[in-house]
Interface confidence: low
C-alpha cells in the first residue's frame, strides 16, 4: 500500500479516504511508514506510532517490519493487501489477531515481519514465541 493519498486530521491521527471521499471502514492500522526505533532485545515492543489509519482497501491488513543493521534499527508500520507480497515475502499470518514477528532471510541485516487483522494490531509487535500458544489475550480473541 502507498501511504494514504488523501487524509483528514482527526484527533491528531489520520483517516484515509478514497477518491469519492468514502472512508474505508474495515481495518484500522498503525501507519507511520519507516521510523527509527529503539526496540531491541525485547519480548514485545510498542510501535510508538501516533498515526492510526483506516486502510485504503477493505481487504488490507496491518503489517509491521522490524529491521536492524550495523547503523540503526527501524520499524515500519503500514496497511497492505495480503494477496500481494510485501518486501518480497507473503503475509502468511495475515489472519492472526496479534502481530507475532517472524524472522526472514535478508542479506546484510536482521529482518522480522508480522501481519495481523485486528484493529491497530501492529501497534504491539511480539517477538516472544510464547505468545503463539500461551497468551490468554490471544486465546480470547481467537476463541471467544
Amino acid at each position: 500500500t502507498i501511504p494514504p493519498h488523501v487524509q483528514k486530521s482527526v484527533n491528531n491521527d489520520m483517516i484515509v479516504t478514497d477518491n469519492n471521499g468514502a472512508v474505508k471502514f474495515p481495518q484500522l492500522c498503525k501507519f507511520c511508514d519507516v521510523r527509527f526505533s529503539t526496540c531491541d532485545n525485547q519480548k514485545s515492543c510498542m510501535s510508538n506510532c501516533s498515526i492510526t489509519s483506516i486502510c485504503e482497501k477493505p481487504q488490507e491488513v496491518c503489517v509491521a517490519v522490524w529491521r536492524k543493521n550495523d547503523e540503526n534499527i527501524t520499524l515500519e508500520t503500514v496497511c497492505h493487501d495480503p494477496k500481494l507480497p510485501y518486501h518480497d515475502f507473503i503475509l502468511e499470518d495475515a489472519a492472526s489477531p496479534k502481530c507475532i514477528m517472524k524472522e526472514k532471510k535478508k542479506p546484510g541485516e536482521t529482518f522480522f515481519m508480522c501481519s495481523c487483522s485486528s484493529d491497530e494490531c501492529n501497534d504491539n509487535i511480539i517477538f516472544s514465541e510464547e505468545y503463539n500458544t500461551s497468551n490468554p489475550d490471544l486465546l480470547l480473541v481467537i476463541f471467544q
Epitope: 484527533n11 471502514f25 495475515a94 484493529d119
Partner: antibody, heavy 122, light 107 residues
Framework: EVQLVESGGGLVQPGGSLRLSCAAS????????MTWVRQAPGKGLEWVSV????????YYADSVKGRFTISRDNSKNTLYLQMNSLRAEDTAVYYC???????????????WGQGTLVTVSS | DIQMTQSPSSLSASVGDRVTITCRAS??????LNWYQQKPGKAPKLLIY???SLQSGVPSRFSGSGSGTDFTLTISSLQPEDFATYYC?????????FGQGTKVEIK
C-alpha cells in the same frame, strides 16, 4: 460473557447537553473499536460514531459532526458519547456496540448494549 | 454515503413459511454486508456477517447470499421467535449504513 451497559440517557431541552456512558465487561476492551448507533422512536437504525481501540481515531455521521464527541477510558472499560447542542431529531434510543475483530466479520457489530433513551424536548 | 434499500418493508407470513428479504446497495460493496434481527424493545442481534456467514449461536434456518449490490436473507422455515424486524448493513465504507428494515409479522 460479553456485556455492554449504557447509562446517562434522559430528558433534555433543545440546545442542552448530555453524556452517555457504556460500561463494558467480559472482553479485552482496549483492542476493540466501539460504536454508537441510535434508533429514533418507530424508526430504523442510524450509525452515529466509531472510535478505535486506542481512542486515537474517531469518525462521525454527518448529522452529529461538530456536536457529538466519542471517547473512551480504557482503564475503566468505558465508552462515552458527549452530546452537545441537542436537537429534537436527536431523540432516540442510543446503543453502544462492539465492532468485531474477526477478519471476515470486521465492520459488523457483534455485541450490543440494551440502549438508553435520550429525549430532546421543551 | 452508500444507500441500502430493503424490500419488502413489511411482510406477513405463517410459521413454517420460507421467507426471503432482499437488500440492494447503491454501489458495489463486495461481500461487506451484515444482517441483524431486532425484536420490540430489544437491541439488534447480529445474524449474518460477510453476506453469508452465520454468526455463532444463530439457527441454521437463517442464511444469507449475494455479492456486489444485491443480497438476500432467507429464513427456510419461519419459527414463532423469528417474528421481528430485520436490517441489512453495509460495512464496506464509513458511515456503515443500514437498510430501512423489514418487519416480519404473523399472518
Amino acid at each position: 460473557e460479553v456485556q455492554l451497559v449504557e447509562s446517562g440517557g434522559g430528558l433534555v431541552q433543545p440546545g442542552g447537553s448530555l453524556r452517555l456512558s457504556c460500561a463494558a465487561s467480559g472482553f479485552y476492551f482496549d483492542i476493540y473499536a466501539m460504536t454508537w448507533v441510535r434508533q429514533a422512536p418507530g424508526k430504523g437504525l442510524e450509525w452515529v460514531s466509531v472510535i478505535s481501540g486506542s481512542g486515537g481515531t474517531t469518525y462521525y455521521a454527518d448529522s452529529v459532526k461538530g456536536r457529538f464527541t466519542i471517547s473512551r477510558d480504557n482503564s475503566k472499560n468505558t465508552l462515552y458519547l458527549q452530546m452537545n447542542s441537542l436537537r429534537a431529531e436527536d431523540t432516540a434510543v442510543y446503543y453502544c456496540a462492539r465492532r468485531s475483530q474477526y477478519r471476515d466479520k470486521v465492520g459488523a457489530t457483534d455485541y450490543w448494549g440494551q440502549g438508553t433513551l435520550v429525549t430532546v424536548s421543551s | 454515503d452508500i444507500q441500502m434499500t430493503q424490500s419488502p418493508s413489511s411482510l406477513s407470513a405463517s410459521v413454517g413459511d420460507r421467507v426471503t428479504i432482499t437488500c440492494r446497495a447503491s454501489q458495489s460493496i463486495s461481500s461487506y454486508l451484515n444482517w441483524y434481527q431486532q425484536k420490540p424493545g430489544k437491541a439488534p442481534k447480529l445474524l449474518i456477517y460477510a453476506a453469508s456467514s452465520l454468526q455463532s449461536g444463530v439457527p441454521s434456518r437463517f442464511s444469507g447470499s449475494g455479492s456486489g449490490t444485491d443480497f438476500t436473507l432467507t429464513i427456510s422455515s419461519l419459527q414463532p421467535e423469528d417474528f421481528a424486524t430485520y436490517y441489512c448493513q453495509q460495512s464496506y465504507s464509513t458511515p456503515p449504513t443500514f437498510g430501512q428494515g423489514t418487519k416480519v409479522e404473523i399472518k
